[in-house]
C-alpha cells in the first residue's frame, strides 16, 4: 500500500474526474467514492416557521 | 445496521506499539475512506489518519507519520493502526470513523457518520 | 495545514435559548465543513455536513451556514440535551482539521 497522497501529487487536490453511478469524488481523499444521493425536501407548507432542513439518502450499500 | 467496533487499546510502556482494529458491519469499508481520531483526556479531537481501502491511499497527521501505519483487510471488513514508538503524549481515546458522502455535482458532499465507542491507550512507565 | 478557529470556546445558556458557534478557517474550504456534537465519555455524532445540510435524525432546531472561511452552528432553542461540546471540522484538503471545541453549559 503507497504511503499517501502527498508523497504522489501534495495535498492540492486536481480536478474532479468521473465516477461510475454510485459514486463520486471525494476531494479530501482525491478518489472516487461511495456516495448517496443528496435531495432537498419539498418546501414546507405557506405560514411554516423554518424552511425544511435540507437532508440526504443514505449511500447504498 | 452500521457498525464501527474498536479494540486493542491498553497500557504500553514508552516506545512500545499496539495494534488497534476497527471491525466495521452493515457496509463495506473498501469504497469508504475510515478515519482514526483520537482525543487525550480533557482535550479536542486530533484527526490522525485515514485509508481508503479501494484505492490503497492513506494520508497521517504529521504528528504521527512515520511511527503509525493504517491498513485495512476487506475480506475482514476491519481497518488497522499499527503504532509504534508510542510516546506519553499519544495516551488519548482512539476512534475510528466511516467519512460518508453524498453526490452533490459529483463531488463529495460528507462527514464522518459512523464512529466506534473509543479504545483507550495510555503511554506511560 | 489549514486552523479552524472556534468560537466562544465556552458558553453558558438556559434552555429555550438561541445558541450560535462561529467557526473560521485559515483559508478557503469553500463549503466542505462537518460540525458535531460530543458528549462526555461518548464519540462524536455528526450533525450538519457540507457546511448546511442536516444530517439524517437530528433536529431540525439545529442548522448551519457558511461558506469560504466563516461558518455557523445555530441552535434555535435550546433543549436540555444539547448541552454538550460543539466542534467543526474542515475536509476540503488533507488532512482534515477539526477546531478547538465549544463548550456548551446550563446557566
Known amino acids: 500500500m503507497r504511503r499517501g497522497p502527498r508523497s504522489l501529487r501534495g495535498r492540492d487536490a486536481p480536478a474532479p474526474t468521473p465516477c461510475v453511478p454510485a459514486e463520486c469524488f471525494d476531494l479530501l481523499v482525491r478518489h472516487c467514492v461511495a456516495c448517496g444521493l443528496l435531495r432537498t425536501p419539498r418546501p414546507k407548507p405557506a405560514g411554516a416557521s423554518s424552511p425544511a432542513p435540507r437532508t440526504a439518502l443514505q449511500p447504498q450499500e | 445496521e452500521v457498525q464501527l467496533v474498536e479494540s486493542g487499546g491498553g497500557l504500553v510502556q514508552p516506545g512500545g506499539s499496539l495494534r488497534l482494529s476497527c471491525a466495521a458491519s452493515?457496509?463495506?469499508?473498501?469504497?469508504?475512506?475510515i478515519h482514526w481520531v483520537r482525543q487525550a483526556p480533557g482535550k479536542g479531537l486530533e484527526w490522525v489518519a485515514w485509508?481508503?481501502?479501494?484505492?490503497?491511499?492513506?494520508d497521517y497527521a504529521d504528528s504521527v507519520k512515520g511511527r503509525f501505519t493504517i491498513s485495512a483487510d476487506t475480506s475482514k471488513n476491519t481497518a488497522y493502526l499499527q503504532m509504534n514508538s508510542l510516546r506519553a503524549e499519544d495516551t488519548a481515546v482512539y476512534y475510528c470513523?466511516?467519512?460518508?458522502?453524498?453526490?452533490?455535482?459529483?463531488?463529495?458532499?460528507?462527514?464522518?457518520?459512523?464512529w466506534g465507542q473509543g479504545t483507550l491507550v495510555t503511554v506511560s512507565s | 495545514d489549514i486552523q479552524m478557529t472556534q468560537s466562544p470556546s465556552s458558553l453558558s445558556a438556559s434552555v429555550g435559548d438561541r445558541v450560535t458557534i462561529t467557526c473560521r478557517a485559515s483559508?478557503?474550504?469553500?463549503?466542505?465543513v462537518a460540525w458535531y456534537q460530543q458528549k462526555p465519555g461518548k464519540a462524536p455524532k455528526l450533525l450538519i455536513y457540507?457546511?448546511?445540510f442536516l444530517y439524517s435524525g437530528v433536529p431540525s432546531r439545529f442548522s448551519g451556514s457558511g461558506s469560504g472561511t466563516d461558518f455557523t452552528l445555530t441552535i434555535s432553542s435550546l433543549q436540555p440535551e444539547d448541552f454538550a461540546t460543539y466542534y467543526c471540522q474542515q475536509s476540503r484538503i488533507t488532512p482534515p482539521t477539526f477546531g478547538q471545541g465549544t463548550k456548551v453549559e446550563i446557566k
Open positions: 483559508q478557503d474550504v469553500s463549503t466542505a
Open positions: 457540507s457546511a448546511s
Open positions: 485509508i481508503l481501502p479501494s484505492a490503497g491511499s492513506t
Open positions: 470513523a466511516r467519512r460518508v458522502c453524498y453526490n452533490r455535482l459529483g463531488v463529495c458532499a460528507g462527514g464522518m457518520d459512523y
Open positions: 452493515g457496509f463495506s469499508i473498501a469504497r469508504s475512506s
